[in-house]
């Protein structure tokens, strides 16, 4: 099991939507989910 | 909007491979996990592998591992999945899926 | 590996009443870290399959709030309030507790 990652569910979880304040801020990166870097948490 | 398009169809004959394509858009494609997904005719859904495109680094499906290779070319942001030594129970819709995201699929029909 | 399994079909429903569909894993799917690693996918007639909920009970973006999910390690449920016609299709839970990923055979959702 990929333990260098926080969950196991790195590979589906999908983008979360942002909360409503960060929603027009200039970092587009995922909040959740594969987006992370692939080198892990 | 985030893409991931599929060639419709292959008609490859046994014995023989085929390659098949998956082109990412929309979004960063070097970030993503992208999984390889079949389908038979009428059947469920199983899980083939899947390859981070900014390492190569792949994990597969143990039932595949001889049938299928999982490769990316960064520079066209497409991710590939050869299949080899085909046969009649390779013919099916397969997917290629980034999480929320799946591609068209492509109906490959293995047949003399 | 972890076996997924759903009834083929669900008990007809009509038009705007609830509908559930149940799903079994061979192993619980509820993890120390207090995550249960259930999903559930719908796949419409003719098209790819959609992520519909995600780690059991949370709903993926653009999904609709007639969908919920529950259920314990081992058993779960998808429910449907208010079916409607473009809920037709085929319901599929997987497992992303463990490689390989696995799906169960698919419930498909009958409208009377």
């Known amino acids: 099991q990929a333990t260098e990652y926080e969950y196991l569910d790195y590979d589906f979880l999908p983008e979360t939507e942002p909360p409503e304040m960060l929603r027009n801020s200039t970092d587009t990166t995922p909040l959740t989910g594969p987006g992370t870097p692939e080198s892990g948490k | 909007q985030v893409q991931l398009q599929q060639p419709g169809a292959e008609l490859v004959k046994p014995g023989a491979s085929v390659k098949l394509s998956c082109k990412a858009s929309?979004?960063?494609?070097?970030?993503?996990?992208m999984h390889w997904v079949k389908q038979r005719p009428g059947q469920g859904l199983e899980w083939i592998g899947m390859i981070h495109p900014n390492s190569g680094r792949t994990n597969y499906n143990e039932k595949f591992k001889s049938k299928a290779t999982l490769t990316v070319d960064k520079s066209s942001s497409t991710a590939y999945m050869q299949l080899s030594s085909l046969t009649s129970e390779d013919s099916a819709v397969y997917y290629c899926a980034r999480s929320d995201y799946w591609g068209q699929g492509t109906t490959l029909t293995v047949s003399s | 590996d972890i076996v997924m399994t759903q009834a083929a079909f669900s008990n007809p429903v009509t038009l705007g009443t609830s509908a559930s569909i149940s799903c079994r894993s061979s192993k619980s799917l509820l993890h120390s870290d207090g995550i249960t690693y259930l999903y559930w996918f719908l796949q419409r007639p003719g098209q790819s399959p959609q992520l519909l909920i995600y780690?059991?009970?949370n709903l993926a973006s653009g999904v609709p709030d007639r969908f919920s999910g529950s259920g314990s390690g081992t058993d779960f449920t998808l429910r449907i309030s208010r079916v409607e016609a473009e809920d037709v299709g085929v319901y599929y839970c997987?497992?992303?507790?463990?490689?390989?990923?696995?799906f169960g055979g698919g419930t498909k959702l009958e409208i009377k």
């Open positions: 780690r059991m009970s």
């Open positions: 997987a497992q992303m507790l463990e490689f390989p990923r696995t």
């Open positions: 929309g979004y960063t494609f070097t970030s993503y996990w």
